[in-house]
Amino acid sequence: QSGPLPKPSLQALPSSLVPLEKPVTLRCQGPPGVDLYRLEKLSSSRYQDQAVLFIPAMKRSLAGRYRCSYQNGSLWSLPSDQLELVATGVFAKPSLSAQPGPAVSSGGDVTLQCQTRYGFDQFALYKEGDPAPYKNPERWYRASFPIITVTAAHSGTYRCYSFSSRDPYLWSAPSDPLELVVTGTSVTPSRLPTEPPSPVAEFSEATAELTVSFTNEVFTTETSRSITASPKESDSPAGPARQYYTKGN
């Protein structure tokens, strides 16, 4: 075969947003018959020639960026897309409110505001049932997420997180849920006016993986402004389908 082997996929099950002390599994999926997998934690010198990482209880030191690749014969694949494993519940939850209120007419405007008592410069808003992450900068303890020309598609349950760009994989606990109610009829579904979602891969049970445990290792995290989606819901236990709207510098 000429050229590099196609990249595998790397997913976090059940989610890439993991509360401290809760379980998560990282799985690397390549084609059948792979000779060797390599799963590595970026910004550390740690890697394992295995393709699955079972974590019984999430730790701060495990948060960060991961990627994997595989080898067939003497050929190495391209690396997977990076997976960003986030530890949540590291800080107290922010509060989430809607201005002018959580009930809004279709076609109207609403602003969701996430506020924290800490000096965080990053905020993430997600809507249950939607698939991907967004970003947008803000500082000074609060972030506003305007939703222009609201449609029925914006109805749902929202939560937000706060965190620091200096430790981008250590997040607060989620805010209490805010239920946004849209009254009237909707013409077309719309999204927040921010960047488009990242593509999300699905987990297939035919994955070739091995077991490995990083749980006794101590890792460092590297500052990054990129927060990716957690895995999309699929037939195998996978991540929650949620949409993220992230504000940061």
Epitope: F54, P56, E205, L210, S213
Partner: antibody, heavy 117, light 107 residues
Framework: VQLQQSGAELVRPGTSVKVSCKAS????????IEWVKQRPGQGLEWIGV????????NYNEKFKGKATLTADKSSSTAYMQLSSLTSDDSAVYFC???????????WGQGTTLTVSS | DIQMTQTTSSLSASLGDRVTISCRAS??????LNWYQQNPDGTVKLLIY???RLHSGVPSRFSASGSGTDYSLTISNLEQEDIATYFC?????????FGGGTKLEIK
Amino acid sequence: VQLQQSGAELVRPGTSVKVSCKASGYAFTYYLIEWVKQRPGQGLEWIGVINPGSGVTNYNEKFKGKATLTADKSSSTAYMQLSSLTSDDSAVYFCARSIYYGTIDYWGQGTTLTVSS
Amino acid sequence: DIQMTQTTSSLSASLGDRVTISCRASQDISNYLNWYQQNPDGTVKLLIYYTSRLHSGVPSRFSASGSGTDYSLTISNLEQEDIATYFCQQGSTLPYTFGGGTKLEIK
């Protein structure tokens, strides 16, 4: 995915028994194996979990010293040994596959253990 | 240990009914809540994992929701094959624990 457990056992109090669970239809070392107890007409009790790839185990405190979990990668078989048996150990024991800690996606058919003199 | 409570131990319903089974945890389990079905022959199957995710091959008439400590399983259009005992289980914190079960019967 199939988890085939060994057959029913009738044993004397004070003895030990080893229940087997043969996995097929998937790569044995890619998933965890958990064990669950169910006494007649009662609920389910989690015993423990083993990572077949590494041999790492976690037990319910209640079953430490009672249950020992092992796995043989070459035969894709998990085992649970129960020691110092009493009538309280009479139950159906399930092995099950889990995709991450604490979430079982496939169950064995169960092995009935009867402890009686 | 986290206690899982299914307050209704048995439930009678008619075919075609919408049935809801509830489960309460003694502390926040962060959506690590699974639902299992045990048939009269003793076989156990996963229905729902991580609060609301439908396992492969499970009919869409099954759905579930919840957060924090309160969770529920709903069968929207009860069929004969749904007659079974339903268990909730938390996979949040060791040791993982199950509810006492809710036995579903036909009226």
